[in-house]
Interface confidence: low
């Protein structure tokens, strides 16, 4: 999906008002210095690409993020403020339904959400670092 057509300010508002708090809730009890940020982004569309990938694509050791509150709110924000986004996510939704129904917070998931926090901060104010 090409995120360049999204309404960035509306997504930013959604992040600041709710998504950021849900990310903090998920990470509660974890030291902010525990994980190093290894995923980066420069432009806001690039940040959304990385956020979408980390939030909704199951990874080894962390298959359950898509059912978390921050993920559902992220999906809603993208669906509302990125034209045509919903249509591209039909297959992804089917895959999500096949994922485990139980929500398990593994260390790998905590690390992944820590990366997401960094990406969202970059999206909130892109730092235009070297690719």
């Amino acid at each position: 999906y090409d995120f360049t057509n999204c309404d960035f300010e509306k997504i930013k508002a959604a992040y600041l008002s709710t998504i950021s708090k849900d990310l903090i809730t998920y990470m509660s009890g974890t030291k902010s210095t525990e994980f190093n940020n290894t995923v980066s982004c420069s432009n806001r569309p690039h940040c959304l690409t990385e956020i979408q990938s980390l939030t909704f694509n199951p990874t080894a050791g962390c298959a359950s993020l898509a059912k978390e509150m921050f993920a559902m709110k992220t999906k809603a924000a993208l669906a509302i403020w990125c034209p045509g986004y919903s249509e591209t996510q039909i297959n992804a939704t089917q895959a999500m339904k096949k994922a485990r129904k139980s929500k398990v917070t593994t260390n790998k998931c905590l690390e992944q959400v820590s990366q997401l926090q960094g990406l969202w901060r970059r999206f909130n104010r892109p730092l235009l670092k070297q690719q």
């Epitope: 360049t4 420069s42 432009n43 569309p45 892109p126 235009l128 670092k129 690719q131």
Partner: antibody, heavy 117, light 107 residues
């Protein structure tokens, strides 16, 4: 209304330094990066570098790393570009431009720097 | 560094003509390309960003498109105020680079 107002034209001798200012208004100064672009007479646009006004982090292209200093004064929402060891090929119009995603939605009016002995 | 090759370097056209300017990136920059218009003695003015998004206040006769690493700026019906120099610029990451410019002159 967003505005970037640059300092006036300068005439300098080779070897001297010049400091160009760019005063921002109409937006939150620390939210946007400030970039500097120059244009030699009759030539195209050349990106020089950028500064993050929130923490003064700078990125400069290799050819300017030794001679350009980018600074900001947050209290006055002003960005500065200082170019040292001036030579004749530095004669150009210098622009400041703000950006969030890498494209420039607002530019300063330009400052002409003439290097002549 | 990413090189931006812009063509033609100049062109002559008449009012009402359809004008096309192209820019080729030396590597994949996705949609991270902007177009600017510059008139003599003035700062450049943003026309298009993210390859095809029209900047605020820019007339709809300007449009942008992308195919792989090839980018196109089209002016559907050239107006007297459109005679100027046009630059492309990638905004994929540092260092930002500009195309060499295309001067649109009156035929």
């Amino acid at each position: 209304e967003v505005q970037l107002v640059q300092s006036g034209a300068e005439v300098k001798k080779p070897g001297a330094s010049v400091k160009v200012s760019c005063k921002a208004s109409g937006y939150t100064f620390t939210t946007y990066w400030m970039h500097w672009v120059r244009q030699a007479p009759g030539q195209g646009l050349e990106w020089m570098g950028m500064i993050d006004p929130s923490d003064s982090e700078t990125t400069l292209i290799q050819k300017f790393k030794d001679r350009v200093t980018l600074t900001v004064d947050k209290s006055t929402s002003t960005a500065y570009m200082e170019l040292s060891s001036l030579r004749s090929e530095d004669t150009a119009v210098y622009y400041c431009a703000r950006t969030l995603d890498g494209y420039y939605d607002y530019w300063g009016q330009g400052t002409t720097v003439t290097v002549s002995s | 560094d990413i090189q931006m090759t812009q063509s033609p370097s100049s062109l002559s056209a008449s009012v009402g003509d359809r004008v096309t300017i192209t820019c080729r990136a030396s590597e994949n920059i996705y949609s991270y390309l902007a177009w600017y218009q510059q008139k003599p003695g003035k700062a450049p003015k943003l026309l298009i960003y993210f390859a095809k998004t029209l900047a605020e206040g820019v007339p709809s006769r300007f449009s942008g498109s992308v195919s792989g690493t090839d980018f196109t700026l089209t002016i559907s019906s050239l107006q007297p105020e459109d005679f100027a120099t046009y630059y492309c610029q990638h905004h994929y990451g540092t260092p930002w680079t500009f195309g060499g410019g295309t001067k649109v002159e009156i035929k």
